[in-house]
């Protein structure tokens, strides 16, 4: 008798979330910084929520959070939450340091 092959698809809530920062976690003021919420999820994440160090939700819901021009006041810890049809997951905190530059201060 011929055997049938079955594929079992496992659905799971977002996991292993992390915030990556480009060009890095230390950015000179006036430049741009992009925070990306990376995750493993099935089905893929359908909705992202971003939070700052006060656990205040930010008005951004895409996978990438772009800050341009970045300001020293943007410095702090950020985390993201990913949601799919199965559930939610959250990342650890990642710290962004936006630093003063003598050049930009001199142009003020």
């Amino acid at each position: 008798t011929a055997s049938k092959a079955w594929t079992l698809e496992v659905l799971y809530a977002p996991r292993r979330l992390r915030v990556s920062m480009s060009p890095g976690d230390q950015v000179m003021e006036g430049k741009s910084a992009t925070l990306t919420c990376e995750s493993d999820a099935n089905p893929p994440v359908s909705h992202y929520t971003w939070f700052d160090w006060n656990n205040q939700s930010l008005p951004y819901h895409s996978q990438k959070l772009r800050l341009e021009p970045v300001k020293v006041q943007h410095s702090g810890a950020y985390w993201c939450q990913g949601t799919n049809s199965v559930g939610k997951g959250r990342s650890p905190l990642s710290t962004l340091t936006v630093y003063y530059s003598p050049e930009t201060i001199g142009r003020r």
Epitope: Q26, S75, G76, T97
Partner: nanobody, 121 residues
């Protein structure tokens, strides 16, 4: 309490050199952006040089090509090598450190004595 202690200042003739040190007491020194500032009598504090954890550096136009900022993460020290010194470099020099939104010294704080650099002509 985290401390920053500057040293290495002194009296030097124009054209001479000095190396300033900023010794920091935080265990995670390598994660901090480090700054050197200076304040001349009757003037506002001025940012001179910046170095990131990854040794990216930036300088004020007035010191470019003459001053070099560096760091030794193993010793938790930031340096300012000052060459071709000019009388207008005379000031008290201070360091500062930043991680995220935390500055070890805030602008309203008493920044202490710093280290005095005097350049005579």
């Amino acid at each position: 309490q985290v401390q920053l202690v500057e040293s290495g200042g002194g009296l030097v003739q124009a054209g001479g050199s000095l190396r300033l040190s900023c010794a920091a007491s935080m265990s995670s020194f390598s994660q901090y952006v480090m700054y050197w500032y200076r304040q001349a009598p009757g003037k506002q504090r001025e940012l001179v040089a910046t170095i990131t954890s990854y040794s990216n550096t930036n300088y004020a136009d007035s010191v470019k090509g003459r001053f070099t900022i560096s760091r030794d993460n193993a010793k938790s020290i930031a340096y300012l090598q000052m060459d071709s010194l000019k009388p207008e470099d005379t000031a008290v020099y201070y360091c500062n450190a930043q991680y995220g939104s935390t500055f070890i010294r805030n602008h309203w704080d008493d920044w202490g004595q710093g280290t005095q650099v005097t350049v005579s002509s």
